[in-house]
């Protein structure tokens, strides 16, 4: 909005910063147990996994960066039940990976989470 | 803990995933006005900036990934006061950038935020 008052290079840097903050899928660390809603006596090793989740800014304060498309990534994790009654089991855990994002006015009806197969 | 039961490759993949989820500085999008605690009639363009903030997992549930060292990055932003009495002003805004992180048991006494010069 102030192109006539500031040099082009400064405006370019500011604009590039803005582009980088825009709503998009970003690599995020998610805690498996809390996403999965598992009981307190079930643990995963590693407890966290890296996936892409929607994040960043929108052009309007009233809009929220939400996922519009999702894929599910299978992560191999050790599932440990306490007390240990058996050897920790290697299980495939399907984790939601956001592949598309959009600035939307309301929270979605069905938030995407983790699916155990 | 289960090296004897599973092939080395699977364990290597799991370990690499775990390393990548560990508590460390991660690029994050922060909303300037809310961090700065500015009044509702002051806006920034862009409203968000990219900085590094501590994030990720800790080995114990009781620990939180916290910043241990911080640098301040100067970001050039337009500050807009409404009603507009003058041209939007290009101001340097100092934003906390976490350079070191550690899994700690309690919240810090002094959370780092944004400093206006």
């Amino acid at each position: 909005f102030a192109a006539t008052f500031y040099d082009i290079e400064t405006l370019k840097v500011i604009d590039e910063e803005w582009q980088r903050t825009q709503c998009s899928p970003r690599e995020t660390c998610v805690e498996v147990a809390s996403e999965l809603g598992k009981s307190t006596n079930t643990f995963f090793k590693p407890p966290c996994v890296n996936v892409f989740r929607c994040g960043g800014c929108c052009n309007e304060e009233s809009l929220i960066c939400m996922n519009t498309s999702t894929s599910y990534i299978s992560k191999q994790l050790f599932e440990i039940s306490v007390p240990l009654t058996s050897v920790p089991e290697l299980v495939p855990v399907k984790v939601a990976n956001h592949t598309g994002c959009k600035c939307l006015p309301t929270a979605p009806r069905h938030p995407y989470s983790i699916i155990r197969r | 803990f289960a090296a004897t039961f599973y092939d080395i490759e699977t364990l290597k993949v799991i370990d690499e995933e775990w390393q990548r989820t560990q508590c460390s500085p991660r690029e994050t999008c922060v909303e300037v006005a809310s961090e700065l605690g500015k009044s509702t009639n002051t806006f920034f363009k862009p409203p968000c900036v990219n900085v590094f903030r501590c994030g990720g997992c800790c080995n114990e549930e009781s620990l939180i990934c916290m910043n241990t060292s911080t640098s301040y990055i100067s970001k050039q932003l337009f500050e807009i006061s409404v009603p507009l009495t003058s041209v939007p002003e290009l101001v340097p805004v100092k934003v906390a950038n976490h350079t070191g992180c550690k899994c700690l048991p309690t919240a810090p006494r002094h959370p780092y935020s944004i400093i206006r010069r």
Epitope: F1, Q19, E60, E61, S62, P105, T106 | F43, K45, V82
Partner: antibody
């Protein structure tokens, strides 16, 4: 200063399409959503939808879904609104309006009168 | 859709006297982020609308101090402390908390 310059008045036959343009200047085009609002003669304002020029994402008023398409050309900082299958009750002044981060439509084009008549 | 109801639809006022326009929404306009996206627009004859007030009570650039906005939840008011000749036109409330964005039907301000 911020300016939104709209294309000229149009007269269309029922069933035809119209494409209205809105050229923006004086600000970073991709940093603000562009709204389209219409006003029938002597009537109030009706919101048609908006486009995010950064990525082309659109949100339309259900009333116009399937008939309206909003696009942008970031190289020329121009927003477009196309309305198809025109009816006589689509006769209105069509406005583009920039929307600020806090939600108010802070700058408006002067409007484009679209007349639908056989 | 959120219905915005303005009263009165027509308001004849004497120059220099105060004027008040009410706007009621069919649902609360408080967003999940705590903000209320209720705005007021002025449309002078033959002109495009112009933003007066944003987010209930914030005056926009170049808007005279005689204009003020107030309210919360579903009930909002636009006040003009002393009406001037240039204030003649139609005033609209609008909300951007919910989609679709909606407007009130307008209140015509005229001089007695």
């Amino acid at each position: 200063q911020v300016q939104l310059v709209q294309s000229g008045a149009e007269v269309k036959q029922p069933g035809a399409s119209v494409k209205v343009s809105c050229k923006a200047s004086g600000y970073t085009f991709t940093g603000y959503n562009m709204y389209w609002v219409r006003q029938a003669p002597g009537q109030g304002l009706e919101w048609m939808g908006y486009i995010d020029p950064y990525n082309g994402d659109t949100t339309y008023n259900q009333k116009f879904k399937g008939r309206v398409t909003m696009t942008t050309d970031t190289s020329t900082s121009t927003a477009y609104m196309e309305l198809r299958s025109l009816r006589s009750d689509d006769t209105a002044v069509y406005y583009c309006a920039r929307t600020s981060y806090y939600g108010g439509m802070d700058y408006w084009g002067r409007g484009t009168l679209v007349t639908v008549a056989s | 859709d959120i219905v915005m109801t303005q009263t009165p639809l027509s308001s004849p006022v004497t120059l220099g006297q105060p004027a008040s326009i009410s706007c009621r929404s069919s649902q609360s306009l408080v967003h999940s982020n705590g903000n209320t996206y209720l705005h007021w627009l002025q449309q002078r004859p033959g002109q495009p609308p112009r933003l007066l007030i944003y987010k209930v009570s914030n005056r926009f650039s170049g808007v005279p101090g005689r204009f003020s906005g107030s309210g919360a939840g579903t009930d909002f008011t636009l006040k003009i402390s002393r009406v001037e000749a240039e204030d003649v036109g139609v005033y609209y409330c609008s909300q951007s908390t919910h989609v679709p964005r909606t407007f009130g039907q307008g209140t015509k301000l005229e001089i007695k």
